[in-house]
Interface confidence: medium
């Protein structure tokens, strides 16, 4: 039971990093050429 | 040819207001985040703002936060740089860039000077 | 905030000589998509600046092959293979890897 916790709580910490990344990139592209490759 | 033209700088008193403005041609100005970055004389560059390309998201350094607006009209071709509560530290050469690929600032103005004296 | 420093801040240089100027950076340029957002700009005596290198190493258009850049993480280094006269200026080093974007200090290119 302590094991599937510890590792449901690593796979959230993950995700989270994941999402804050993966917002973190978006929002900077919004702020210059957002379709990189359409010029 | 793609160039961006700033306008609006002067000599103004502290405390007072300034509207700066930019006009874009030669590329499709929608699909572009848009900053302003400045140079006191004599001095280094220093990065102010951003917009992105469809004005919803804005990004300010800590010098100018509150002071400062950001803002574009994509229907126009233009950028704009309302300044409130100018400091005779805000005296500098204010130049528009463009936000290009690879995150660089690939297209800039020729500038307008500002100068906040009394 | 990421703090940019440049060595030298001063360059005299022959004409015909190839130049150097290093860049660091406060911490990692990296960022999570593997790019690293270093960019190089030239600013000649009464000019508005101008890009030269975006990423690192990647030459904007119109920008001699003599220009060239390298280096990774927080340690970046510009150079001109030959200095003309034209190179004559001041060269800043920028991050737009996190807000808020800094420059560096700006290095000054001069002919001995």
């Known amino acids: 039971k302590h094991k599937c916790f510890r590792k449901e709580l690593e796979e959230n910490e993950t995700l989270e990093s994941i999402m804050n990344t993966a917002e973190s990139e978006e929002e900077l592209k919004k702020y210059f050429y957002y379709l990189e490759g359409s010029k | 040819q793609v160039q961006v033209v700033e306008s609006g700088g002067g000599v103004v008193q502290p405390g007072r207001s300034l509207r700066l403005s930019c006009a874009a041609s030669?590329?499709?100005?929608?699909?572009?985040?848009m900053h302003w970055v400045r140079q006191a004389p004599g001095k280094g560059l220093e990065w102010v703002t951003v917009?992105?390309?469809?004005?919803?998201?804005?990004n300010y350094a800590d010098s100018v936060k509150g002071r400062f607006t950001i803002s574009r009209d994509n229907s126009k071709n233009t950028l704009y740089l309302q300044m409130n509560s100018l400091r005779a530290e805000d005296t500098a050469m204010y130049y528009c860039?463009?936000?290009?690929?690879?995150?660089?600032?690939?297209?800039w103005g020729q500038g307008t000077m500002v100068t906040v004296s009394s | 905030d990421i703090v940019m420093t440049q060595t030298p801040l001063s360059s005299p240089v022959t004409l015909g000589q190839p130049a150097s100027i290093s860049c660091r950076s406060s911490?990692?340029?990296?960022?999570?998509?593997?790019?690293?957002?270093l960019s190089w700009l030239q600013q000649r005596p009464g000019q508005p600046p101008r890009l030269l290198i975006y990423?690192?190493?990647n030459r904007f258009s119109g920008v001699p092959d003599r220009f060239s850049g390298s280096g990774a993480g927080t340690d970046f280094t510009l150079k001109i293979s030959r200095v003309e006269a034209d190179d004559v200026g001041v060269y800043y080093c920028?991050?737009?890897?996190?807000?808020?974007?800094?420059f560096g200090p700006g290095t000054k290119v001069d002919i001995k």
């Open positions: 860039a463009r936000g290009g690929s690879g995150f660089a600032f690939d297209i």
């Open positions: 030669g590329f499709t100005f929608s699909n572009y985040g």
């Open positions: 917009i992105s390309y469809d004005g919803s998201n804005k």
């Open positions: 911490q990692s340029l990296v960022r999570s998509d593997g790019n690293t957002y």
């Open positions: 990423k690192i190493s």
């Open positions: 920028m991050q737009t890897t996190q807000f808020p974007f800094t």
